[in-house]
């Protein structure tokens, strides 16, 4: 016959935290390392599983199809209960009865999920919601891939996602000095760069690249490049295209300039010649299927031209340049230099030799163009 279990036989209650969908092992150890009778029950005293002879038997609980035990460890006095595919409602106090002792284990199951799709456009907000058992008071701390820390209770909000928020977020849920860690993969849909500037001499070929900061197996969308030339009063659509997986197909392209677009990712455009009339800035937008909003990348084109006309040597730049950029004309191997924080510099009656036109930013040369000035002989005076 079974002995009554006294209060002193009741071991201190352990707290175990579990993750929704995961597997948890609740341990229960007998003092003697041998196979003996044991039972696991829930707080309502409903039997979940136990031993009968040498066989595992299961009771009428809701856990019967998800609960198991490691039979191989029974003869070592270990009578753990394994619960698979954890649910929030599995949170309960579980009692292990062995050797006339009761071991209580409180299981608290938590779930952490993103409220929306985990593929979000740059600038959109991310909300993480914690599912927790009634009566619990957990705290949550999340760390972004970039090292940003955010704390909260049942919900955590990131108002404006940035490129560097892409990757695995690690969230720690704490309750009763115990912790459980969640990992959530967030993909921020954006271009690698928000803005880029291409510096070219007049006549050179121009390449614009728009690499994405993410990779997706299936990628469908459409895009357009609008261009605002410095010399033009209004912007113009240069190209429209479709995207399917890695395949890019041009829908419509302007006749001037004669742009060419690569037929596969990363998005890439080629302008046959850099000309002053093309200098300016563009905005490439990409709308992805099933996503609200668009991805944007700004691109700037700065064009340089060096010319000699009669006694005047001129260097000019067109396009978006910052006021701190310096434009200078200097004679190779000579000290002669003219510098200005302007978009044009010139030298009257330049000395013969190879002149360099330089566009620089704090000493760093962004663009240079060479022009040879030939000596001009004075015309002989007619007698």
């Amino acid at each position: 016959e079974q002995k009554l279990i006294s209060e002193e036989d009741l071991a201190a209650k352990k707290v175990v935290l579990g993750k929704k969908g995961d597997t948890v092992e609740l341990t229960c150890n007998a003092s003697q390392k041998k196979n003996t009778q044991f039972h696991w029950k829930n707080s309502n005293q409903i039997k979940i599983l136990g031993i009968q002879g040498l066989f595992l038997t299961k009771g009428p609980s809701k856990l019967s199809d998800r609960a198991d035990s490691r039979k191989s460890l029974w003869d070592q006095g270990c009578f753990s209960m394994i619960i698979k595919n954890l649910k929030i409602e599995d949170s309960d106090t579980y009692i292990c009865e062995v050797e006339n002792k009761k071991e209580e284990v409180e299981l608290l199951v938590f779930g952490l999920t993103a409220n929306s799709d985990t593929h979000l456009l740059e600038g959109q907000s991310l909300t993480l919601t914690l599912e927790s058992p009634p009566g619990s008071s957990p705290s949550v701390k999340c760390r972004s891939p970039g090292g940003k820390n955010i704390q909260g209770g049942r919900t955590i909000s990131v108002p404006q996602l940035e490129r560097q928020d892409s990757g695995t977020w690690t969230c720690t849920v704490s309750q009763d000095q115990k912790t459980v860690e969640f990992k959530i993969d967030i993909v921020v849909l954006a271009f690698q760069k928000a803005s880029s500037t291409v510096y070219k001499k007049e006549g050179e070929q121009v390449e614009f690249s728009f690499p994405l900061a993410f990779t997706l197996e299936k990628l469908t969308g459409s895009g357009e490049l609008w261009w605002q030339a410095e010399r033009a009063s209004s912007s113009k659509s240069w190209i429209t295209f479709d995207l399917k997986n890695k395949e890019v197909s041009v829908k419509r392209v302007t006749q001037d300039p004669k742009l060419q677009m690569g037929k596969k990712l990363p998005l890439h455009l080629t302008l046959p010649q850099a000309l002053p009339q093309y200098a300016g800035s563009g905005n490439l937008t990409l709308a992805l299927e099933a996503k609200t909003g668009k991805l944007h990348q700004e691109v700037n084109l700065v064009v340089m031209r060096a010319t000699q006309f009669q006694e005047n040597l001129t260097c000019e730049v067109w396009g978006p340049t910052s006021p701190k950029l310096t434009l200078s004309l200097k004679l190779e191997n000579k000290g002669a230099t003219v510098s200005k924080q302007a978009k044009a510099v010139w030298v009257l009656n330049p000395e013969a030799g190879m002149w360099q036109c330089l566009l620089s930013d704090s000493g760093q040369v962004l663009l240079e163009s060479n022009i040879k000035v030939v000596p001009t002989w004075p015309t002989p005076v007619q007698p």
Epitope: Q205, E207, D242, K244, N245, K246, E247, S249, Q260, M261, G262, K263, K264, H268, T270, P272
Partner: antibody, heavy 118, light 107 residues
Framework: EVQLLESGGGLVQPGGSLRLSCSAS????????MSWVRQAPGKGLDWVSS????????YHADSVKGRFTISRDNSKNTLYLQMSSLRDEDTAVYYC???????????WGKGTTVTVSS | AIQMTQSPSSLSASVGDRVTITCRAS??????LGWYQQKPGKAPKFLIS???SLQSGVPSRFSGSGYGTDFTLTISSLQPEDFATYYC?????????FGQGTKVEIK
């Protein structure tokens, strides 16, 4: 094993028409870009036409635009090239080719010969 | 259309020689370039994609390099089975264009 088998070549008079077929096996036909490339006797390779499996978009070389039409029947795993207003210079071995995931022509058929002559 | 200029159009070499074939694009094509080998009466064989990526089963004596407009195919030590015609293909945009070919003959 990926296999491509062209058929439909033959002798045709200038101004005539011909339809080439390419039967594909060993891969998910509808997922890939398919192309036709030709080679005139003793000459180099000359891209003729491509068709996307994902979008159905078609692309043709300027030399055949308005005369040749590429099409596909994904249910039959077959690629076609409808050729009309044929000229002497269209005489060539016509190869069917499959693009890989990176959009390069990686697998080619053995070719079918088209001769345009009066 | 983008023009592809291949050089030389033919070359004579001996087994064990190092052979270099160049291909120049009329405009920048990133690294969207493939190399093909063709033997008489046979279909072309795909050797290299993305200018330098060797296809599986292609011997390591073949290598490719280049970006933008200038590309190179190198055979480090020519073997008897390498005597063939080699073509470059720009795969940057449609229309796709091949180089005119380089015939590698036995000296």
């Amino acid at each position: 094993e990926v296999q491509l088998l062209e058929s439909g070549g033959g002798l045709v008079q200038p101004g005539g028409s011909l339809r080439l077929s390419c039967s594909a096996s060993g891969f998910t036909f509808s997922d890939y870009v398919m192309s036709w490339v030709r080679q005139a006797p003793g000459k180099g390779l000359d891209w003729v036409s491509s068709i996307s499996g994902l979008t159905g978009n078609t692309y043709h070389a300027d030399s055949v635009k308005g005369r040749f039409t590429i099409s596909r029947d994904n249910s039959k795993n077959t690629l076609y090239l409808q050729m009309s207003s044929l000229r002497d210079e269209d005489t060539a071995v016509y190869y069917c080719a499959k693009d890989n995931e990176d959009y390069y022509m990686d697998v080619w058929g053995k070719g079918t010969t088209v001769t345009v002559s009066s | 259309a983008i023009q592809m200029t291949q050089s030389p159009s033919s070359l004579s070499a001996s087994v064990g020689d190092r052979v270099t074939i160049t291909c120049r694009a009329s405009q920048g094509i990133r690294n969207d370039l493939g190399w093909y080998q063709q033997k008489p009466g046979k279909a072309p064989k795909f050797l290299i994609s993305a200018a330098s990526s060797l296809q599986s089963g292609v011997p390591s004596r073949f290598s490719g390099s280049g970006y933008g407009t200038d590309f190179t195919l190198t055979i480090s030590s020519l073997q008897p089975e390498d005597f063939a015609t080699y073509y470059c293909l720009q795969d940057y945009t449609y229309p796709r264009t091949f180089g005119q070919g380089t015939k590698v003959e036995i000296k």
